[in-house]
């Protein structure tokens, strides 16, 4: 696909960055847990 060709020396990109500063808050890792017998289990 010519639209996504890459020259020699460049690899296909896979990572997604937080490029816009305004997205910093919406991309902070959230810990969602389940309380089981007094212990929080991450899920």
């Amino acid at each position: 696909d010519a639209e996504f060709r890459h020259d020699s020396g460049y690899e296909v990109h896979h990572q997604k960055l937080v490029f816009f500063a305004e997205d910093v808050g919406s991309n902070k890792g959230a810990i969602i847990g389940l309380m089981v017998g007094g212990v929080v289990i991450a899920c």
Epitope: K16, F19, F20, A21, E22, D23, V24
Partner: antibody, heavy 112, light 112 residues
């Protein structure tokens, strides 16, 4: 792999309308701001619209304000640009961009 | 809007020699998280812009280590340690600290 694929460009008469679409894949679309950037022949990059991750905030430069509308459907992983009252000076390649990734571009030609 | 000013606008280079492009912003690009969202793109003829350096000095995946970025606050630099034939094109600096996303005018790099 992250991909952004635009569609909807073409030839339109002055005063006409077009709706561009950008199908996103390979990342969690709903977490990221998105933009439309255009490039007139032989010119530099010009932002024409920007929208935040949830679609609640948008930005337009004066050159397109009131004529262009950016929107997104996070359920469909798709970004849109509705372009009305098109002018000859809107002729350009329009790119959908997440900043780090750009689509292949779609050509919009406004001519009678 | 934040104005991005690049220099030079045209840069003839010799293969194997270093090259440097300067970018200045009209206001500080430091965000509240301590990062400067200053980026560098390369656009080759007929292609979409491609991210080279993000947040001042970080090479994007797959970008050769001959590319490096530096700077802080309002003054930034892109350096190519040894120019190769595939490095020709137009280089843009860009900021995404502030809305709207803005670009420099572009620096055209060509082989002497």
């Amino acid at each position: 792999e992250v991909q952004l694929v635009e569609s909807g460009g073409g030839l339109v008469q002055p005063g006409g309308s077009l709706r561009l679409s950008c199908a996103a894949s390979g990342f969690t679309f709903s977490r990221y701001s998105m933009s439309w950037v255009r490039q007139a022949p032989g010119k530099g990059l010009e932002l024409v619209a920007q929208i935040n991750s949830v679609g609640s905030s948008t930005y337009y430069p004066d050159t397109v304000k009131g004529r262009f509308t950016i929107s997104r459907d996070n359920a469909k992983n798709t970004l849109y640009l509705q372009m009305n009252s098109l002018r000859a000076e809107d002729t350009a390649v329009y790119y959908c961009a997440s900043g780090d990734y750009w689509g292949q571009g779609t050509l919009v030609t406004v001519s009678s | 809007d934040v104005v991005m000013t690049q220099s030079p606008l045209s840069l003839p280079v010799t293969l194997g020699q270093p090259a440097s492009i300067s970018c200045r912003s009209s206001q500080s690009l430091i965000y509240s998280d301590g990062n400067a969202y200053l980026h560098w793109f390369l656009q080759k003829p007929g292609q979409s812009p491609r991210l080279l350096i993000y947040k001042v000095s970080n090479r994007f995946s797959g970008v050769p280590d001959r590319f490096s970025g530096s700077g802080s606050g309002t003054d930034f630099t892109l350096k190519i340690s040894r120019v190769e034939a595939e490095d020709v094109g137009v280089y843009y600096c860009s900021q995404s600290t502030h809305v709207p996303w803005t670009f420099g005018q572009g620096t055209k790099v060509e082989i002497k």
